[in-house]
């Protein structure tokens, strides 16, 4: 297509635009208002003059120029039409070839660009998604941190407040402690003085008791001897009376066998005529060594040598091997006769063992073994028992076969623990076994669920700590 347009630009200059197909031609013409022709009106290359021209003259010139321009334009258009007519075919062919080649290249470039763009877009989408995820995660974490921080701040505030309270309390308590310390030291001083006085008193009383015990033993022995002498005198008197009343009797001298003055056990003392329960002196077999024992001359026919007694917790039974070997306590109260003496005694003759028990409810029971002996120290005074009868359980509460004796300083039991330390007292512990008559003494109402009490399982069950116990021996042929 082709078209022609005439216009004025923003500065007031005239411009001519010719549009032909895809091409556009713009002509900007020189301003002639201030120019003057020299001699000829058609000459335009004259030198510019200083003085302005008349207005009418300028207009005239302009119109002439316009006419010339229009003629030129028409001529150009004709020329253009001619070129177009003659060149059209060749141009079309050339354009087609160029377009085709360019199109192929362009398509290729376009495709490549599209692919790259798609790839970039995908990458961007992925990155965008990741960024979004990350952002969301970070936001969540930030929120959680914020919440945690708030909580922590609150906790810190609470704790600070608590610390302040505690500090106040602490100061108050410190003051109280200081006050109490003062009072306590005064009381302690007073108690120390009292303790010293009591110790003096106790030592005095102990010596008095020792004296009294000695006197009692002497009195008991004297009493026993007097009883025996009285018994002998009565017999002599009776025999004398019989002799005197008999007319055929010959005067004869009553020959008395030598009086026995040493006894190996209470059965011998009983048989010698001393039938009052009390403390007597016994002699070790085949030795002059003596030991004091309590003889029970009343229970089951008498003649019993008491080897152990518990009744009130006055004596500590958590003792060493040496103490259990030699004996401890007082025969008038709680005591252990001594493993060495019992071992020697029961090793020479057959003895029976009787165990008497009392509970806190007023009940009594006993166990009787028809054969009892202790092995020597080299066998840790192992206990041997057979033939159980009695009311304190059908099963023996002393483990069978017999166990070795154990004390706090000599562990001979069958336990992974140390029974004597765990249960208290020296005993023929198994692991640890159903009995311990040398355990910790517990008073009434505190005597159940005890792990270390005075125990005889097959009578009172586990954890029951008994009120009183007595172990006594007597020859089987008494």
């Amino acid at each position: 297509y082709s078209n022609f347009r005439k216009s004025v630009d923003s500065t007031g200059r005239r411009q001519y635009q010719v549009q032909n197909g895809p091409c556009s031609y713009t002509f900007l013409l020189p301003e002639t208002d201030s120019c003057r022709s020299s001699s000829s009106p058609y000459m335009s290359n004259a030198v510019q003059r200083d003085a302005p021209l008349d207005y009418d003259d300028s207009v005239q010139r302009l119109q002439v120029l316009e006419n010339i321009l229009e003629n030129n334009t028409q001529w150009l258009m004709k020329l253009e039409n001619y070129i177009q007519d003659n060149m059209k075919k060749e141009m079309v062919e050339i354009q087609q070839n160029v377009v085709q080649n360019q199109t192929a290249v362009m398509i290729e470039i376009g495709t490549s660009l599209l692919n790259q763009t798609a790839a970039q877009t995908r990458k961007l989408t992925d990155v965008e998604a990741q960024v979004l995820n990350q952002t969301t995660r970070l936001e969540l974490q930030l929120l959680q941190h914020s919440i945690s921080t708030n909580k922590l701040e609150k906790q810190i505030l609470d704790q600070t407040s608590e610390i302040n309270k505690l500090q106040n309390k602490n100061s108050f308590l410190e003051q109280k402690v200081l006050d109490m310390e003062g009072k306590h030291s005064e009381q302690l001083q007073s108690m120390k003085e009292q303790k010293d006085e009591l110790q003096v008193l106790v030592s005095k009383q102990s010596s008095v008791i020792d004296e009294l015990e000695k006197k009692l033993v002497t009195a008991t022995v004297n009493n026993s001897l007097l009883q025996k002498q009285q018994h002998d005198l009565m017999e002599t008197v009776n025999s004398l009376l019989t002799m005197m009343s008999s007319p055929n009797s010959k005067s004869s001298v009553a020959i008395r066998k030598e009086e026995q003055t040493t006894f190996r056990d209470c059965a011998e003392i009983f048989k010698s005529g001393l039938t009052t329960s009390g403390i007597y002196t016994l002699t070790f077999p085949n030795s002059t060594e003596e030991i004091k024992a309590y003889c029970d001359m009343d229970v089951g026919g008498g003649g019993w040598t008491v080897i152990q007694h518990r009744e009130d917790g006055s004596v500590d039974f958590q003792r060493t091997w040496k103490e259990y070997k030699e004996g401890f306590g007082s025969p008038l109260g709680e005591y252990w006769l001594g493993n060495e003496f019992v071992s020697q005694l029961t090793g020479q003759h057959r003895y029976v063992l009787k165990i008497q028990l009392k509970d806190w409810e007023g009940n009594e029971a006993h166990s009787l073994y028809d054969h009892f002996y202790l092995a020597g120290e080299e066998s840790n005074y192992r206990i041997h028992l057979t033939g159980l009868t009695g009311t304190a359980g059908k099963i023996s509460s002393i483990s069978q076969p017999g166990s070795d004796f154990s004390t706090k300083d000599s562990d001979n039991d069958k336990c992974i623990c140390k029974c004597s330390q765990m249960l208290s007292g020296g005993w023929w512990f198994d692991a640890c076994g159903p009995s311990n008559l040398n355990g910790q003494y517990y008073p009434q109402k505190q005597n159940t669920n005890k792990f270390n009490g005075i125990k005889w399982y097959y009578w009172k069950g586990s954890g029951y700590s008994l009120k009183a116990t007595t172990m006594m021996i007597r020859p089987a042929d008494f």
Partner: nanobody, 129 residues
Framework: EVQLVESGGGLVQPGGSLRLSCAVS????????IGWFRQAPGKEREGVSA????????YYADSVKGRFTISSDNSKNTVYLQMNSLRPEDTAVYYC??????????????????????WGQGTLVTVSS
């Protein structure tokens, strides 16, 4: 003073479940073994299950293996006996008892009944339809 208090007993149908609790005070479960025992009318008291070392070692009588589970919660000083698939022959008074954990015979794993020195009062379990 050592105290053991049983709870959780009651009436349950055959095949049912019960959970017994033994609350212990005066001792810590770390140093003691706790056993569950039962006594049916006219019968001897028998061991059912035991636990020591905070559950590290457990014992079950053959008659309850696979049905009963013993466990402990040291923070509460309590031992539990979960009893499932209960049978009429499980009817008895159930007791819990304590023994120092070290009171063990060489080579043995568990304790004779007479070694348990602290006992609860018992809780009755009746299994009946």
């Amino acid at each position: 003073e050592v105290q053991l208090v049983e709870s959780g007993g009651g009436l349950v149908q055959p095949g049912g479940s019960l959970r017994l609790s033994c609350a212990v005070s005066g001792i810590t479960l770390d140093d003691y073994a706790i056993g569950w025992f039962r006594q049916a009318p006219g019968k001897e008291r028998e061991g059912v299950s035991a636990i020591r070392e905070s559950g590290g070692s457990t014992y079950y009588a053959d008659s309850v293996k696979g049905r009963f589970t013993i466990s402990s919660d040291n923070s509460k000083n309590t031992v539990y006996l979960q009893m499932n698939s209960l049978r009429p022959e499980d009817t008895a008074v159930y007791y819990c008892a304590a023994v120092p954990a070290g009171r063990l015979r060489y080579g043995e794993q568990w304790y004779p009944i007479y070694e348990y020195d602290a006992w609860g009062q018992g809780t009755l379990v009746t299994v009946s339809s």
